[in-house]
């Protein structure tokens, strides 16, 4: 640790005195102290000497000697008082800048330690301190306002009692800055803009911050726009607003607009796109396939995306048949706005009934005309099967009718014994009918197919089963021949045919 001569913590001298402060260390040493006049600095081997032959009140302060090469950073200090009866204060600063809630040190250094008992801090022109101002005093350093607040940004003076009268220091301006959490907050309105050529448009870029020191600008396709700025202060925030007004837009006004604000913490920017069109437009689309297939009893949401400018003047969902003249219930139609020019319209069809298959159309209208988008909804059904015994051209024939959607496939099984359903162990013969006859196939209806199995002689201790299946499910019908006729077994029930 360096050593200072004279080896006293404080030195009190009169104005005009010669003061010599010598610092000696193991290596090179360096003096640090307040910016003040009249000092001469010179080196003498491993010591550094600070001297003045005309000390003034301005030399009052703490002088510290350090060894720059010392990794432990040891230092020694001496405080010099130059007690001038006419100048009780040496003020080291015109201005002190701190952030809110920091301690603010107002560097009024007392030039005579004897005066410490009668010191006080006041605002300029003798005004008292603001309420709740918590401060302390150190003769070496000055007054400290603890946890300074923005409202305490004032001009202050230090006061000392000398011979019964108060002597003031020159003033110190305290600037308490708000803590800036980050770059200014930004808004750019609208987020997107579409106009027809010749219409008026307005784009508003605004930025706000707790501190007034920030810049904001609006740029179009990387060109900074010269727009007058409006400033305001409310809700404890400074606001700067740039408003671009275009009376008659043209294609050159289209493009990307960016609102950019910056302060000491950094920069924020937000962008929007301005589209200029020749005329009104209305576009309907769907991410769904326009041809929909849903199993009966299930639900479906039909969604249409609408892009339009100007806004819609009307819209509705319509059922175009073929089953009934019912119309979708309004409560099942839902509209959501994605943004100003894009909307999604949804029709909810819960627990679909057979009569609800068919065409659903969404119609929309704006000044550009009207558009429609139509969905075709077909319901899927599991096959329903029935078998009858008949004679065709004199031959005994089993006739199987299967009805469902999609079109069912048909398989015949012959098995031993009398049973509701053939299982693998009983199966004697299997016939696939790759091309059953289509009896009916209308849009939005079930497909009915018919399969014929010609049987020369019915075996009486056997069962004939017609099975039909599609992507939804399967159905079957068991036919049991008996001497007096035949038994037929639909699934899960018993029928007797005389």
């Amino acid at each position: 640790i360096p050593v200072i001569e004279p080896s006293v913590p404080e030195l009190v001298v009169k104005p005009g005195a010669t003061v010599t402060l010598r610092c000696v260390g193991n290596g090179s040493v360096e003096w640090d102290g307040p910016p003040s006049p009249h000092w001469t600095l010179y080196s003498d081997g491993s010591s550094s000497i600070l001297s003045t032959n005309n000390a003034t009140f301005q030399n009052t302060g703490t002088y510290r000697c350090t060894e720059p090469g010392d990794p432990l950073g040891g230092s020694a200090a001496i405080h010099l008082y130059v007690k001038d009866p006419a100048r009780p204060w040496n003020v080291l600063a015109q201005e002190v800048v701190v952030f809110e809630d920091q301690d603010a040190l107002l560097p009024c250094l007392l030039t005579d330690p004897v005066l410490e008992a009668g010191v006080s801090l006041v605002r300029v022109r003798g005004r008292p301190l603001m309420r709740h101002t918590n401060y302390s005093f150190s003769p070496w350093h000055g007054f400290t306002i603890h946890r300074a607040k923005f409202i305490q940004s004032q001009d202050y003076q230090c006061s000392a009692l000398m011979g019964g009268r108060k002597v003031m220091s020159i003033s110190i301006r305290l600037k308490v800055q708000k803590v800036i959490p980050g770059p200014p907050a930004l808004t750019l309105v609208p987020a997107e803009l579409v106009r027809i050529r010749g219409e008026a448009a307005q784009i508003v870029c605004s930025a706000s911050s707790v501190d007034v020191n920030f810049d904001v600008f609006l740029q179009h396709n990387n060109t900074k726009l010269a727009i007058p700025q409006q400033s305001d202060f409310h809700n404890n925030r400074y606001q700067k607003v740039l408003t671009l007004n275009l009376d008659q837009v043209d294609f050159q006004h289209a493009g990307n607009y960016s609102c950019v604000a910056s302060n000491v913490q950094g920069k924020h920017s937000t962008s929007m796109f301005f589209r200029v069109v020749e005329s009104a437009y209305l576009n309907l689309s769907s991410e769904q396939n326009l041809i929909q297939e849903v199993t009966v009893g299930e639900g479906l949401n039909l969604k249409v995306m609408v892009e339009a400018y100007p806004g819609l003047q009307g819209f509705n969902w319509t059922y175009l048949g073929p089953f009934s003249d019912h119309q979708p219930e309004p409560k099942l139609a839902n509209a959501t706005t994605k943004d100003t020019y894009r909307h999604t319209f949804t029709l909810s069809l819960p627990r679909l009934k057979p009569s609800e298959a068919g065409r659903y159309s969404f119609l929309a209208r704006n000044p550009g005309g009207w558009r429609a988008l139509t969905f075709e909804l077909t319901l899927r059904y599991p096959p329903e099967v029935s078998v009858i015994w008949t004679f065709i051209n004199g031959s005994g024939t089993l006739l199987c009718a299967a009805s469902g959607y999609p079109q069912p496939n048909v398989t015949w099984l012959q098995c031993s014994g009398h049973t509701d359903r053939c299982d693998e162990a009983q199966v004697l013969q299997v016939w696939d009918d790759p091309y059953p006859e289509v009896l009916s196939q209308e849009p939005f209806h079930k497909v009915t197919v018919q399969s014929l199995l010609t049987v020369e002689t019915l075996e009486h201790n056997q069962t004939y089963e017609c099975r039909a299946h599609n992507s939804v499910g399967s159905g079957s019908w068991a036919f049991i021949p008996i001497s007096a006729g035949a038994h037929t077994h639909p699934p899960d029930e018993f029928l007797f045919t005389p």
């Epitope: 910016p35 003040s36 600063a93 201005e95 002190v96």
Partner: antibody, heavy 117, light 110 residues
Framework: QVQLQESGPGLVKPSETLSLTCTVS????????WSWIRQPPGKGLEWIGY???????NYSPSLKSRVTFSVDTSKNQFSLKLSSVTAADTAVYFC???????????WGQGTLVTVSS | QSVLTQPPSASGTPGQRVTISCSGS????????VNWYQQLPGTAPKLLIY???QRPSGVPDRFSGSKSGTSASLAISGLQSEDEADYYC???????????FGGGTKLTVL
């Protein structure tokens, strides 16, 4: 070894605020005092102001109304803000360290700021 | 207009001795020490002389400073081509409570 480095935009528009930062290494800005000096192209040096510990600042009378210094001891940085700039503020801006008896013993390399629209 | 006054230019041939003057007033040079700075083309100023006549380590002893009353001077002996630079004097000013500079002297080595 004490080193100072100025940073900030090289171009500022008239009437806007010039902002520069000086980053110090090899010394603590809690010690000594720290100045900004400028030099217009082809001209001499002009002292702008200095700050001494805890945000205490003194400014050149000719610039006082437009200057603000701020300090970030955690980053060992100090900053200059000069408001309402004109073409006359075009200069190379230097930051420098000072100590008792020597107003400027270490300097940054300087940064040119041009004021133009 | 600079507070301290310096001649705008000075010149000399290699090996010669050149002196640059700096004059001020009682509030600056008269009551405070003088510092000299050398600024090579395109670089930052560098401390050359402090406290009237003290040289920082690394500065050749060809450079010396002196002060008398309200004036100071910088002497460069054994002039070398690398000494071609701008030279500035500076001093604390009591009335300003801050440092002041001279206008600078451009030294040309012929």
């Amino acid at each position: 070894q004490v080193q100072l480095q100025e940073s900030g935009p090289g171009l500022v528009k008239p009437s806007e605020t010039l902002s520069l930062t000086c980053t110090v290494s090899g010394a603590s800005i809690s010690s000594y005092y720290w100045s900004w000096i400028r030099q217009p192209p082809g001209k001499g040096l002009e002292w702008i102001g200095y700050f001494y510990y805890s945000g205490s600042t003194n400014y050149s009378p000719s610039l006082k109304s437009r200057v603000t210094f701020s300090v970030d001891t955690s980053k060992n940085q100090f900053s200059l803000k000069l408001s309402s700039v004109t073409a006359a503020d075009t200069a190379v801006y230097f930051c420098a360290r000072g100590k008792v008896g020597v107003p400027f013993d270490y300097w940054g390399q300087g940064t040119l700021v041009t004021v133009s629209s | 207009q600079s507070v301290l006054t310096q001649p705008p230019s000075a010149s000399g041939t290699p090996g010669q001795r050149v002196t640059i003057s700096c004059s001020g007033s009682s509030s600056n040079i008269g009551s405070n020490t003088v510092n000299w700075y050398q600024q090579l083309p395109g670089t930052a100023p560098k401390l050359l002389i402090y406290s009237n006549n003290q040289r920082p380590s690394g500065v050749p002893d060809r450079f010396s400073g002196s002060k008398s009353g309200t004036s100071a001077s910088l002497a460069i002996s054994g002039l070398q081509s690398e000494d071609e630079a701008d030279y500035y004097c500076a001093a604390w000013d009591d009335s300003l409570n801050g440092p002041v500079f001279g206008g600078g002297t451009k030294l040309t080595v012929l």
